[in-house]
């Protein structure tokens, strides 16, 4: 390609995070170039030999392709002449965790970033009124989190109360014995006030509101990825 | 062994209703991309839904609205249940995992919807 | 919605010689996601090829994948009697999640 050692392309890549049993991303870009077929991405994983996926001369070519990812990777064809040499990983296992690398050669040089790829579970938590309860009480389930997760209440009302005296929380393993369904039940809530069940672990954050009136439930839940 | 075996099929008139059953054994359900595909009869293969190990689901536009693809991890089974039947998804319904690809495939149950 | 289209239609050919299946993409597809299948008359598909090029557990060296992009091909090297059947390729991976070709059907000549 005509590349002299001297000629450096920036690539950048992002801590990414991936939700075991869904696909993921392992970002990474790099400075684009109009000639498609001068473009080579690689990404490797440290400590397996071979490749993870290659892609040279507009397609791909996984004949050196480490058994572990057959049949799971792809780049972003139609994306990499602007850039974006990010690599979607299907049906993401908690193995596939660990140290990738980017490198990239265009004709404009060469350039890697190496990027750490978290694996884990994380889902959205559902709060629900007990009303079965001897006291009204709420419910916060969520399905699927690994490793297992801090669960924490707090009150609009009662703004930095500890609830963890009148909260229960239970860890149930899932059939694949991996993940964890997660259920907290807070005792003793009083209605016109907004609850908050926190559930947290080294890969990702949710939070679920509910705001119990006389007339009406009002629900609210975000997932929010760490360090990504 | 890791086998799939459906259940469930049967005539039934347009407008109506069926749940399907597709019984795992030798892996779990859980931890696959679980999908449902179906064959109307001298026709081609057409993918109808998958739920992924997560739980999150999707289907194929021609069912989107009329069908809803679930599991239950205790009992290590995968269900299609169709709501609102036509004519045209009069079939063979096959349950398949897909690791890799969709390399195990139960035997598929017939679907005839028709008055 | 990624199309995939199948040529020929039907593929008439004698034992031991060899059949060429193409199966073409509307828009280019990953390798990875590209896959082949065997069916034959009242049974499931069966898995023959997946990530374009891999062959399936058990699938006898006779049959090869090859292609990237837009472009696949399914070599059968020399035809056994119990390869006619049809073939189906199909792709992972854009929306809908699945897709499937019409089918090549391979038949006795």
């Known amino acids: 390609f005509g590349i002299s050692g001297k000629h450096f392309i920036t690539v950048t890549t992002f801590t990414s995070a991936g939700n075991i049993g869904e696909d993921g991303t392992l970002s990474c870009t790099f400075e684009p170039d109009i000639k498609l077929n001068g473009i080579v991405i690689q990404w490797l994983k440290e400590g397996i030999k071979g490749l993870v996926h290659e892609f040279k001369e507009g397609k791909d070519d996984l004949s050196q392709q480490h058994e572990m990812f057959r049949g799971r990777t792809a780049v972003f064809a139609d994306q990499v002449v602007v850039g974006n040499a990010s690599l979607r990983l299907k049906n993401v296992q908690l193995t596939d965790a660990g140290t990738y690398t980017c490198y990239i050669r265009t004709s404009k040089g060469k350039g890697n970033a190496n990027l750490e790829y978290k694996t884990g579970a994380f889902s959205m938590p559902e709060i629900n009124v007990d009303y079965n309860a001897s006291s009204e009480s709420l419910r916060c389930e969520a399905p699927r989190w690994f490793p297992q997760p801090t669960v924490a209440w707090a009150s609009q009302v009662d703004q930095g109360a500890n609830f963890s005296e009148v909260s229960n929380t239970s860890f149930e393993l899932n059939s694949e014995n991996v993940t964890m369904k997660v259920v907290s039940v807070l005792y003793n809530v009083t209605i016109n006030n907004t609850y908050s069940c926190m559930i947290e672990n080294d890969i990702a954050k949710a939070t679920g509101d509910i705001k119990v009136t006389d007339s009406e439930v009002k629900r609210r839940s975000q997932l929010q990825l760490l360090n990504s | 062994e890791v086998q799939l075996v459906e259940s469930g099929g049967g005539l039934i008139q347009p407008g109506g209703s069926l749940r399907l059953s597709c019984a795992a054994s030798?892996?779990?359900?859980?931890?696959?991309?679980m999908n449902w595909v179906r064959q109307a009869p001298g026709k081609g293969l057409e993918w109808v839904s998958v739920?992924?190990?997560?739980?999150?689901?999707y289907y194929a536009d021609s069912v989107k609205g009329r069908v809803t693809i679930s599991r239950d991890n205790s009992k290590n089974t995968l269900y299609l249940q169709m709501n609102s039947l036509r004519a045209e998804d009069t079939a063979v319904y096959y349950c398949?995992?897909?690791?890799?690809?969709?390399?195990?495939w139960g035997q598929g149950t017939t679907v005839t919807v028709s008055s | 919605e990624i199309v995939l289209t199948q040529s020929p239609g039907t593929l008439s050919l004698s034992p031991g010689e060899r059949a060429t299946l193409s199966c073409r993409a509307s828009?280019?597809?990953?390798?990875?996601?590209l896959a082949w299948y065997q069916q034959k008359p009242g049974q499931a598909p069966r898995l023959l090829i997946y990530?374009?090029?891999s062959r399936a557990t058990g699938i006898p060296d006779r049959f090869s994948g090859s292609g990237s992009g837009t472009d696949f091909t399914l070599t059968i090297s020399r035809l056994e009697p119990e390869d006619f059947a049809v073939y189906y390729c199909?792709?992972?991976?854009?929306?809908?999640?699945?897709?499937f070709g019409q089918g090549t059907k391979l038949e006795i000549k």
């Open positions: 828009q280019s597809v990953s390798s990875s996601y």
């Open positions: 030798g892996f779990t359900v859980s931890s696959n991309y």
């Open positions: 398949a995992r897909d690791t890799y690809a969709m390399d195990v």
């Open positions: 739920i992924y190990g997560s739980g999150r689901t």
């Open positions: 990530g374009a090029s």
């Open positions: 199909q792709q992972y991976g854009s929306s809908p999640m699945y897709t």
